[in-house]
Interface confidence: low
């Protein structure tokens, strides 16, 4: 199945050129998407190419600039946020990245009514998080780990919390592990729908062990970075949830929301908060052993000014075959009755599907079903539910948007996107306006990405928002590789793979093979998306075949495949890559003396174990920022899949699944090990231990470190990294430079 859209080739073949590494490093063939910043049912904001903030009204067809690029430039603003009453805009500048989602910034408030910045009671700097209330123009912000409230931008702030302390107590923002592994946000506060209440989390990291590493910088002495970071089995953060009435914040102060008794009996996590109404909130909790999740619906008791979470409104989700949920436990989408909700969880056949919960989880009504998975619920209105799935034509790596009519009985289902641009678009996401009056579809491929605007009632396309015409023109004279997505059936396991083939691919010839692997639990690499990246270059210019394989542990193909790796990381993921390689060799066009594997992060772990598998299949391989022992990685992630590193739990497999334990097996492969010294996520410790084990075993290997670089190896390091890896592979495959 060739997924690239066919292009009319220029009759003069010599005008076509291969991709170069420079193309990739310069981002020459990057694409744009268009996500409207919705501000009502029919209006959205968008930052124009010349940096004006423009308001578009779909129904009148009119647009006007609400904030000029001159105003933006006056404070060097890189981002903005309009207050819901449209009186003020916050302007964000001095962006300073912290971890994956978190950053600090300076904020200025601009008054649209008089065209001036608000003077007096200016915001402190740098601020860790700031947001408007959902109605009006109240502001909540976090500064130095404490939460502050302003009724109006020019008012003095009301301080809500006082115990915030760097690396100790976090209010309204997550600590490292909650940010990376649980919430996946930079914030931990949530306004109620009309702005009456503000809920927030407090994380106490006082007893958490600290990871310390050197940051070399330019000074005479390196700085030491200290992060409270719970590794597997270590002491975890203690979380509490509070809610404060923002109208009268001083009246009773923050009220703690009770934790369900069955959760509070042992170590636990808070996983998400969803407001239902101004006086009803839904909290999700998770046991430290992450196979039991409790969803708790709590109501405000006016007489006591407290939050009550009756046991009758506790819903338990439990997995008997793995962990609860997919990567995270799914969040509920409430219906208009403010008590029933829609939620994705495993059905009886082990596929993640949408269920409707009215009273108890046991009586849940299954809304979708089949040997495919519902992936995201975008919006529930009074008569429709919009969701994405990989049902269409049985390709797990696709995403289409569906509408289920819940207003009629029996409900009917319609695929909104399946036939829109079938060859070009098979992987969609969507963004909905209020009440789903309109929505934007963003197609990521396999053809060139395109973003379109649609009527929420009829699904009619209204206009193209971004079609990447410049990219299309730039690619006209490029010899792109061919891509196929197919599957292998092996021992009752389906292994989907994507193969990237050189432009002049000839089945009768032999090609070097590079396996690109990630393979982490609940991940998916084989997706019908557009990309012109390093591996595209390796196929186009260097004549390599590149393959990506989704083996056991990967997502969206049912629990049997997903939970196969439960408590056994590092076994089946590796086996399945090896099995696929053997199948590729059988296809006849792979030079079995020139096979390599590479991966980053979890992929670095898998590639290292594959190289050390003793199969003799791989000539060489690369591990970038690999995990080397699960005892070195974060508790929340690791224990979800591995349990605890204790004798009476799973210590034995923690010890057996390290890269270091297989040091001897690297003797017959060429291994390139790469890591950033300031990696806050997968600590440099992981590669240091691999290197030490290889040295102790007297095994030769190559290595590269990137000073002061984190897990992303960004900036100039990226160029150096890909240049270095290219040389390594070309040498391994005996390709001339």
């Amino acid at each position: 199945i060739v997924l690239r859209p066919s292009r009319v080739h220029n009759s003069e073949e010599n005008t076509m050129r291969a991709l170069t590494l420079k193309d990739i490093l310069n981002g020459t063939f990057s694409y744009k998407t268009f996500f409207p910043n919705w501000i009502s049912g029919q209006e959205y904001l968008h930052q124009s190419a010349d940096n004006n903030i423009v308001l578009y009204n779909i129904e009148t067809g009119q647009s006007y600039t609400i904030l000029s690029n001159r105003t933006m430039k006056s404070v060097n603003a890189s981002n903005y946020g309009l207050s819901p009453d449209r009186q003020f805009v916050y302007l964000e500048s001095d962006y300073s990245k912290l971890w994956r989602y978190s950053y600090t910034a300076t904020y200025y408030i601009y008054d649209l009514s008089n065209g001036e910045f608000v003077r007096g009671n200016e915001l402190p700097r740098p601020i860790q998080y700031l947001c408007w209330s959902p109605v009006g123009s109240k502001l909540a912000y976090v500064y130095q780990n404490n939460i502050y409230l302003k009724q109006r931008p020019g008012d003095p702030p009301f301080q809500i919390t006082f115990n915030g302390r760097e690396n100790k107590i976090f209010n309204g923002i997550p600590d490292w592990v909650y940010e990376e592994e649980m919430l996946a946000t930079k914030y931990a506060l949530w306004w109620s729908p009309n702005g009456k209440f503000l809920a927030y989390a407090e994380f106490n990291d006082t007893d958490i062990p600290v990871i310390a590493y050197s940051y070399y910088g330019d000074e005479q002495y390196p700085r030491t970075i200290n992060i409270p970071y719970p590794k597997a089995g270590a002491k975890n953060p203690v979380v509490r949830i509070f809610i404060i009435d923002t109208t009268y914040p001083a009246y009773v102060g923050p009220q703690e929301v009770p934790v369900p008794a069955m959760i509070a009996s042992s170590d636990y996590y808070f996983s998400w908060l969803t407001w239902v109404t101004d006086e009803r909130v839904c909290l999700q909790w998770l046991k430290r052993v992450q196979n039991v999740s409790v969803l708790s619906i709590c109501d405000f008791r006016e007489d006591w000014q407290t939050w009550d979470c009756p046991k009758t409104q506790e819903h338990i989700e439990e997995s008997r075959t793995g962990w609860a949920g997919g990567f995270f436990v799914s969040t509920p989408v409430f219906s208009y009755d403010a008590i029933s909700y829609y939620k994705i969880f495993s059905d009886k056949d082990g596929y993640k599907h949408i269920h409707y919960i009215k009273d108890t989880v046991e009586n849940a009504i299954q809304i979708t079903s089949g040997k495919w998975e519902a992936i995201n619920i975008f919006r529930v209105t009074q008569d429709s539910l919009f969701y994405s799935s990989n049902e269409f034509e049985e390709y797990p790596g696709r995403r289409n948007i569906y509408r289920i009519s819940i207003g009629s009985y029996p409900p009917s289902k319609k695929c909104v996107t399946c036939h829109l641009r079938k060859e070009r678009c098979q992987y969609y996401t969507a963004s909905f306006s209020d009440y789903a009056k309109y929505y934007a579809l963003v197609c990521y491929g396999p053809g060139i990405p395109i973003s379109t605007l649609h009527d929420g009632r009829t699904d009619q396309e209204i206009k193209i928002l971004e079609e990447n015409k410049e990219l299309e023109n730039a690619l006209k004279n490029i010899q792109l590789p061919k891509e196929e997505i197919k599957k292998l059936e092996v021992d009752e396991i389906t292994l989907w793979y994507k193969m990237i083939l050189p432009p002049q691919f000839d089945r009768s010839k032999k090609y070097p093979l590079l396996i690109q692997v990630y393979g982490g639990p609940c991940s998916q690499s084989v997706r019908s998306v557009f990309a012109v990246n390093w591996i595209s270059y390796l196929a186009s210019k260097e004549g390599m075949v590149i393959a990506l394989v989704d083996g056991r542990g990967t997502a969206f193909q049912g629990d049997k495949l997903l939970y196969a790796v439960y408590r056994k990381l590092g076994v089946y993921e590796v086996e399945d890559q090896i099995t696929a390689v053997r199948k590729f060799i059988e296809m006849g066009f792979i030079d079995e003396k020139r096979i390599a594997i590479w991966g980053w992060s979890y992929g670095g772990y898998v590639s290292s174990l594959a190289l050390a598998s003793g199969t003799g299949l791989f000539k060489c391989g690369i591990a970038v920022a690999p995990v080397s022992s699960w005892e070195y990685y974060a508790s929340v992630y690791t224990e979800r899949f591995m349990g605890l590193p204790t004798k009476d739990d799973n210590l034995e497999h923690y010890k057996n699944s390290t890269v270091m334990a297989r040091a001897e097996y690297f003797r017959n492969v060429d291994y390139l090990l790469i890591h950033g010294t300031a990696d806050d996520n997968v600590h440099f410790q992981n590669s240091a231990q691999i290197a030490k084990a290889l040295v102790n075993a007297q095994v030769d290997f190559q290595a590269m470190w990137y000073s002061d670089q984190n897990h992303g190896l960004s900036g100039l390091s990226t160029n150096h990294l890909y240049t270095h890896m290219t040389h390594f592979l070309k040498q391994c495959f005996s390709l001339s430079d």
């Epitope: 059905d347 009886k348 056949d349 599907h353 009586n363 009504i365 299954q366 809304i367 979708t368 079903s369 089949g370 040997k371 009985y409 029996p410």
Partner: nanobody, 123 residues
Framework: QVQLQESGGGLVEAEGSLRLSCAAS????????MGWFRQAPGLERELVAA???????YYADSVKGRFTISRDNARNTVYLQTNSLKPEDTAVYYC?????????????????WGQGTQVTVSS
Amino acid sequence: QVQLQESGGGLVEAEGSLRLSCAASGRAFGSYAMGWFRQAPGLERELVAAISSGGTTYYADSVKGRFTISRDNARNTVYLQTNSLKPEDTAVYYCAARTGGAAYTRRIDWPYWGQGTQVTVSS
């Protein structure tokens, strides 16, 4: 949309057997969960047996070991083989269908129904 038509009911002596059939018309039969319910005079309609689209089966405790549910997707038909029948098995037997899982015992969770077929077990 799926339409259902039951057949195979009748009068049988205790310890006897019957094979009930339910023919479905409409598209995508294989994607529906199918169930057999029964309703005796003056009693609630109760789930007897159900089978998911993937072939997983569920039985009420009162019929376990005696009744067997099966499906033939090629023929768009679901069967209920009833053995060792007892007088208390006397009821109108209804075929039902739903999109989704099969482990749902409440009548409200099954949107599609047949007309029913009478099974009478004499002592």
